[in-house]
C-alpha cells in the first residue's frame, strides 16, 4: 500500500487585504490515523494555524466537513486576511501518539501573498 | 473561565534579575500565541514581547530586546519572562495577555505583576 | 511603525449621556482594531476588536465604528461604573504591536 501523500496544490496564493484565503490541501490516504494541523512557516518558530484535534481558531473555516468518513480534503479558508498573514502555508499530517502525536508528513506549502486593498 | 494570574513580581537594584510566570486556564494553551505587556505608573500599555503557540517563535519591544527572555511550557499551561539586566525605566505592572489567534487582538489579561527597580 | 492617536486625553461626561472617544492610525490598519477598558487598579479589558465586534459580556451601550485609519468608540449612555481608560489597539502590521496613548472617562 502506498504511503500518504499531502498535496497542497499551489505553490502560491494572492489576496487582497480584508478578502478570504483558500489554501487547499488533501491527503492521498486515510492511513495513518492522526489529526492534521496547518502552520505558516516551518521550523520552531512556525505559527499554529489550524489544529484539527482541539483549539479555537475563529478566522479559519474549513472546506469539507472534516469529521465526514473518508474525508480526504483538508482544505482551509482563512478570513479578513492582512499583511501580517503573509507567509507560506504547511498543511502537516500528524500520526496519532502518546501522549503526543507525532509528525508524519508535511506538504510543501503554499505561498500566501497580499496585496494592499484596492481604493 | 479564562484564567491568567502572573507571579514572581518584586522589587530589585538595578543590573539584577527577576522572572514572572503566568498561569492559564481555561482554554487550549498550546494553541494561543501570548504576550506580556507592561504598564509604568501612571502611564499607558507598552507593548513587552510574543511568544507562538508552540513556543519557538518570538518577538519583543526595542526597548527590551537582549535582556528579556520569553519561553512558555505547554505541559505546564505556563508563560515565562525571564527579566536580566533590569533599569529602573522597567519599573512596571506586567501582565500576560492571551492572543485571540495567530494574528490579532489580546483577548483575555492577567492581573498583573508588579515589578518595581530601585536602588 | 503604526502610530495610534487616541483623542480627547480626557473625557468628563454626565451619567446617561453619550462619549465619544477617537483613535486614528497613521496609516491603515483595515479593520484590524481593538478596543479595552481599564478602571483604577484593574487590568485591562477587551471591549470591542475588529473595529465592530462587542466582545463577550460587553453590554450594548458600547459600539465601535471605523475603518482605515479611523475608528471611534462610543458609549450611548454612560454609567458610573464606565469611569476608565480606554486604550485602542491595532494588529494590523506586527510587531510591534501598538497602544494608543488612552483616553480618559470621567464621569461629571
Known amino acids: 500500500e502506498d504511503e500518504l501523500q499531502v498535496i497542497q496544490p499551489e505553490k502560491s496564493v494572492s489576496v487582497a487585504a480584508g478578502e478570504s484565503a483558500t489554501l487547499r490541501c488533501a491527503m492521498t490516504s486515510l492511513i495513518p490515523v492522526g489529526p492534521i494541523m496547518w502552520f505558516r512557516g516551518a521550523g520552531a518558530g512556525r505559527e499554529l494555524i489550524y489544529n484539527q484535534k482541539e483549539g479555537h481558531f475563529p478566522r479559519v473555516t474549513t472546506v469539507s466537513e472534516l469529521t465526514k468518513r473518508n474525508n480526504l480534503d483538508f482544505s482551509i479558508s482563512i478570513s479578513n486576511i492582512t499583511p501580517a498573514d503573509a507567509g507560506t502555508y504547511y498543511c502537516v499530517k500528524f500520526r496519532k501518539g502518546s501522549p503526543d502525536d507525532v509528525e508524519f508528513k508535511s506538504g510543501a506549502g503554499t505561498e500566501l501573498s497580499v496585496r494592499a486593498k484596492p481604493s | 473561565d479564562v484564567q491568567l494570574v502572573e507571579s514572581g513580581g518584586g522589587v530589585v537594584r538595578p543590573g539584577e534579575s527577576l522572572r514572572l510566570s503566568c498561569a492559564a486556564s481555561?482554554?487550549?494553551?498550546?494553541?494561543?500565541?501570548m504576550n506580556w505587556v507592561r504598564q509604568a505608573p501612571g502611564e499607558g500599555l507598552e507593548w513587552v514581547s510574543r511568544?507562538?503557540?508552540?513556543?519557538?517563535?518570538?518577538d519583543y519591544a526595542e526597548s527590551v530586546k537582549g535582556r528579556f527572555t520569553i519561553s512558555r511550557d505547554n505541559s505546564e499551561n505556563t508563560l515565562y519572562l525571564q527579566m536580566n539586566s533590569l533599569r529602573a525605566e522597567d519599573t512596571a505592572v506586567y501582565y500576560c495577555?492571551?492572543?485571540?489567534?495567530?494574528?490579532?487582538?489580546?483577548?483575555?489579561w492577567g492581573l498583573g505583576a508588579l515589578v518595581t527597580v530601585s536602588s | 511603525e503604526t502610530v495610534l492617536t487616541q483623542s480627547p486625553a480626557t473625557l468628563s461626561v454626565s451619567p446617561g449621556e453619550r462619549a465619544t472617544l477617537s483613535c486614528r492610525a497613521s496609516?491603515?490598519?483595515?479593520?484590524?482594531l481593538a478596543w479595552h477598558q481599564q478602571k483604577p487598579g484593574q487590568a485591562p479589558r477587551l471591549l470591542i476588536y475588529?473595529?465592530?465586534n462587542r466582545a463577550t459580556g460587553i453590554p450594548d451601550r458600547f459600539s465601535g465604528s471605523g475603518s482605515g485609519t479611523d475608528f471611534t468608540l462610543t458609549i450611548s449612555s454612560l454609567q458610573t461604573e464606565d469611569s476608565a481608560v480606554y486604550y485602542c489597539?491595532?494588529?494590523?502590521?506586527?510587531?510591534?504591536?501598538?497602544f494608543g496613548g488612552g483616553t480618559k472617562v470621567e464621569i461629571k
Open positions: 511568544i507562538n503557540s508552540g513556543g519557538g517563535g518570538t
Open positions: 475588529d473595529a465592530t
Open positions: 489597539q491595532q494588529y494590523y502590521y506586527w510587531p510591534p504591536y501598538r
Open positions: 481555561g482554554f487550549s494553551f498550546s494553541s494561543h500565541a
Open positions: 495577555a492571551k492572543q485571540y489567534d495567530w494574528n490579532g487582538f489580546f483577548d483575555y
Open positions: 496609516q491603515t490598519v483595515g479593520s484590524k
